[in-house]
């Protein structure tokens, strides 16, 4: 069984977050991936997402963020640049599987920026700030708007939950139930 | 100590497998993803994936697909690489090696602790 | 695959000496690069992370700069067990891969 968590990563303004989010290769190398955020009580919302089908090592750009999958990995790289209070939140990645619903990824990432300079993250103090070029090769994809009630309608609660679940993805229509479970510190 | 503990030296002949094993202690393995290099003699360190030891996910670099499988006992903190249809440019030591990162998602794909390596010759 | 090209492959210099090795990407990695140490018979060690953080533990004089597709890493005083091979690795693209390695000697 493995652990519904949520990161908590504090960045300052200026620094670029850049995580992974791994997924089971065999089921969806190809598929439609797409980085959401989850505001207080609204529907999570799709800020950017791959081609469909996926393809890869193959950058896609959406204003600030930078999506990229690796198929023969399992990996979808995000990178959010140049990073402003207001990105302050709960994000996800997800997988688009239509007709089904969506499947959510973990972890999920809540962001704090802050006002001021630092190193990025899990650097020392006098480390240089990540600054990321944009590759001149991105493109832009449409990503489909899953507006089905049953998806989640409440953002799940701003510390860890230890929630077991078989695999490594959980499909968004059990998130009401998991969001339930009382949460662990 | 913090440590990963890898099975003795091996000899096979082109055709076979071999399964590689690397014992996590000192830390909770389900916590750091491991990945596994190998290195030819005389020659330099060659990636060959990943392994999520928490939900078993993997990866593979493209020339081992199909020939690599990781696979892990959460149960005694225990990583494997087996490596099939092996052929003499196989003959490598091989490392498991545990990837740090601040944050368990983050990119960041620093190998900060190494198994001490396992031989594996193939020779008919 | 993101080639790595390091020089040089090998060196030899003296104790005291400020010693550079050069790795090159062959496209934009940013900052993602690693710089390992490997003795005979024993597995590589982390020295510099994220091109220029020094790990834990790791001796001041060693250090990395460089971003994009320059990279350098330098010894700033030789010692007699710094005699070792050193990588360089990166982490921009997937997936990846190594320098060739640098041998260090002693004159």
């Known amino acids: 069984a493995t652990k519904l968590t949520e990161e908590k990563y504090e960045l300052k303004e200026g620094q670029t977050l850049d995580v992974k989010c791994d997924y089971t290769l065999e089921k969806f190398a190809s598929s439609q991936k797409a980085w959401q955020i989850i505001r207080d009580g609204e529907m999570p919302k799709t800020l950017a997402c791959t081609e469909r089908p996926s393809k890869n090592s193959h950058p896609v750009q959406v204003g600030r963020i930078i999506l990229e999958d690796y198929h023969d990995h399992g990996l979808l790289r995000v990178r959010m640049v140049n990073l402003q209070v207001e990105d302050s939140g709960l994000y996800q990645c997800v997988i688009y599987q239509p007709p089904k619903e969506p499947h959510m990824l973990f972890d999920r990432i809540r962001l704090v920026v802050t006002k001021g300079f630092s190193g990025t993250p899990g650097s020392n103090e006098n480390s240089t700030q990540n600054v990321y070029k944009i590759p001149p090769t991105t493109t832009k994809a449409l990503c489909p708007l899953y507006t089905s009630p049953r998806t989640v309608t409440q953002a799940p609660p701003k510390s860890t939950a230890d929630v077991s679940t078989p695999d490594s993805e959980i499909n968004l229509t059990n998130v009401t139930d998991i969001i339930r479970v009382p949460v662990f510190n | 100590q913090v440590q990963l503990v890898q099975s003795g030296a091996e000899v096979k002949k082109p055709g076979a497998s071999v399964k590689v094993s690397c014992k996590a202690s000192?830390?909770?393995?389900?916590?750091?993803?491991i990945n596994w290099v190998r290195q030819a003699t005389g020659q330099g360190l060659e990636w060959m994936g990943w392994?999520?030891?928490?939900?078993?996910?993997?990866g593979y670099v493209k020339k081992f697909q199909g020939r690599v499988t990781m696979t892990r006992d959460t149960s005694i903190s225990t990583a494997y690489m087996e490596l099939s249809s092996l052929r003499s440019e196989d003959t490598a030591v091989y490392y498991c090696?545990?990837?740090?990162?601040?944050?368990?998602?983050?990119?960041?794909?620093?190998?900060?602790?190494w198994g001490r390596g396992t031989l594996v010759t193939v020779s008919s | 695959d993101t080639q790595m090209t390091q020089s040089p492959s090998s060196l030899s210099a003296s104790v005291g000496d400020r010693v550079t090795i050069t790795c090159q990407a062959s496209q934009d990695i940013f900052n993602d690069l690693n710089w390992y140490q490997e003795k005979p018979g024993k597995a590589p060690k982390l020295l510099i992370y994220h091109a220029s953080n020094l790990e834990t533990g790791v001796p001041s004089r060693f250090s990395g700069s460089g971003s994009g597709t320059d990279f350098t890493f330098t010894i700033s005083s030789l010692q007699p067990e710094d005699i070792a091979t050193y990588y360089c690795?990166?982490?921009?693209?997937?997936?990846?891969?190594f320098g060739g390695g640098t041998k260090v000697e002693i004159k």
């Open positions: 090696a545990r990837r740090r990162a601040v944050y368990r998602s983050s990119w960041e794909w620093y190998f900060d602790l």
């Open positions: 690795q990166q982490y921009g693209n997937l997936p990846l891969t």
């Open positions: 392994m999520n030891p928490n939900r078993g996910n993997t």
């Open positions: 000192g830390y909770t393995f389900t916590s750091y993803d």
